[in-house]
Amino acid sequence: SQPSASPGEPSPPSIHPAQSELIVEAGDTLSLTCIDPDFVRWTFKTYFNEMVENKKNEWIQEKAEATRTGTYTCSNSNGLTSSIYVFVRDPAKLFLVGLPLFGKEDSDALVRCPLTDPQVSNYSLIECDGKSLPTDLTFVPNPKAGITIKNVKRAYHRLCVRCAAQRDGTWLHSDKFTLKVRAAIKAIPVVSVPETSHLLKKGDTFTVVCTIKDVSTSVNSMWLKMNPQPQHIAQVKHNSWHRGDFNYERQETLTISSARVDDSGVFMCYANNTFGSANVTTTLKVVEKGFINISPVKNTTVFVTDGENVDLVVEYEAYPKPEHQQWIYMNRTSANKGKDYVKSDNKSNIRYVNQLRLTRLKGTEGGTYTFLVSNSDASASVTFNVYVNTKPEILTYDRLINGMLQCVAEGFPEPTIDWYFCTGAEQRCTTPVSPVDVQVQNVSVSPFGKLVVQSSIDSSVFRHNGTVECKASNDVGKSSAFFNFAFKGNNKEQIQAHT
């Protein structure tokens, strides 16, 4: 740019030749003169932005080379400058290149391939191997600077391009550039740990892996112990992978080789990038020794009807994991171990459930069922009292020598025996008869067996032909036995018993 002096004001230097651009053939002499009484220096800015200085007011370059293409600026002591852009035209070197090409996503990237000859046509960008450039790629050519790729996308990463132009109808190409794209950070890192809680015994090894995912390797990550102020943990193993161009994954493995009780606490895996931070925590509890805690069972007394099924369910916490589980029936080891399963899918889970399924229970199968569980450090048990409810069964119904009618019934719960009389004309016996004697016989050794009840009435009270019913009943059901009377005169001719 040339000066336009105003009277009384300091004016910028004058350059000869007085033009904004100059074309010099390679091998010829480049001669520039700076005219200014207060001349200070010439500076030449190369195509790769380096500065060359010259304190003489005449810049003479014999046998000019293409690399001397660029901006020449003359400055004076008043700080005023004038510039001229020089093209050193070389038939063998149309483009000035040689620098890597970097770009940031969503920003512009300059392909540095300025021309040594402004009089070429179709200055443009092409894909290295003649393929099409991405359809959404737009560029702006500038002969003095290069070609600007507008609004760089991630998809352009490692795109190979050349600058191209036509001279006298012939296409000329620059050296190759591959664009290295730096992703714009548009989200916080993704941070995860497989388990959010850990329980260990003193001396055990604590290992937890934190996975950090981001678009760039520049993500920062670390393990912190919250106690309660965050403390950086240095002893961490790192592993990282590029799962793709913008899919970076790092694993930070925290290991405490011999955990102490005071290592218990909250550990945070923290990661941050230029967008923000993310974290995830995991809790460690270190216990002095292992344990087994059986959860209180709502009801250890279980009533079940004969022939039905029942599940005995025990929930417990155990660490280390249980080694032995067994069920004991009436103090005898049962072949049935029950079905043991973990309460949740969490790998560090310490909650277990054991379920013993008793199918089609018989009246004789009531009793104590004890679940025993143990690990290397502890043991625990819980006992269920199982009562099998059975419908009463009349065992005997007899006329005794002393004229008594006796009915013996068994069942659980304890049956009640009621007596009824009816004449032959009646459909059902409804007239109650009070028993003379009722006895409960505990014939079972076990308190869980059926209960036997004996009831008697005096047959002499009956004066008419008819039927006596002995009815045994409990919560489960009822059973009856019948005695038929026939009188001849004043004597009872016959007593027939039937059910």
Epitope: F48, N49, E50, L99, P100, L101, F102, D129, K131, R158, L159, C160, D175, K176, F177, T178, K180, R182, S216, T217, S218, S240, W241, H242
Partner: antibody
Framework: QVQLVESGGGVVQPGRSLRLSCAAS????????MHWVRQAPGKGLEWVAV????????DYTDSVRGRFTISRDNSKNTLYLQMNSLRAEDTAVYYC???????????WGQGTTVTVSS | DIVMTQSPLSLPVTPGEPASISCRSS???????????LDWYLQKPGQSPQLLIY???NRASGVPDRFSGSGSGTDFTLKISRVEAEDVGVYYC????????FGQGTRLEIK
Amino acid sequence: QVQLVESGGGVVQPGRSLRLSCAASGFTFSRYGMHWVRQAPGKGLEWVAVIWYDGTNKDYTDSVRGRFTISRDNSKNTLYLQMNSLRAEDTAVYYCAREDWAEAFDMWGQGTTVTVSS
Amino acid sequence: DIVMTQSPLSLPVTPGEPASISCRSSQSLLHSNGYNYLDWYLQKPGQSPQLLIYLGSNRASGVPDRFSGSGSGTDFTLKISRVEAEDVGVYYCMQALQTITFGQGTRLEIK
């Protein structure tokens, strides 16, 4: 002329620190991605770290992450490697290398030796 | 990380004879841009490594044309058409597709 010159190596005890420098000349340093590569005695080459031309992106091999820091001062045309908590297995000749347009190492320094020993 | 495996690890060659070194990667080094991110380096005794071949098959500036690189995906080969005494040293392949890894090296020596 175009060259890379490393310095700062030496003998150091385990757990101590050392800072390596790589002085670049003869090219526009601020336009190139730069790397550190090491070679343990009698062993092969191992990539250590990279820094982008403007210092924005960095990456490390897993064995040095958290202990080593790569940095650069473009005004001084110098690349650095700050090495903390040094271990015996960090003993090696450390080379700085320039990454070219094809992501290959087209220029290497002569190397500087780091010995970690008690 | 991508594992690079070279063979042979030692290669005695008579001057004037050809030589061939193989490099295999644990996953493909072919980028979607069509280039294989595989380079070959030579480290002469007592010297720093120097670039021979980049992007699988392109000779670096100043490298004699007796050196050539070929291959794609996971299998690559460096060939020296006629070995000269100055070619002695350790040859390394290197992948730059992901976090950079080198092969273990092949020592070329004159018989």
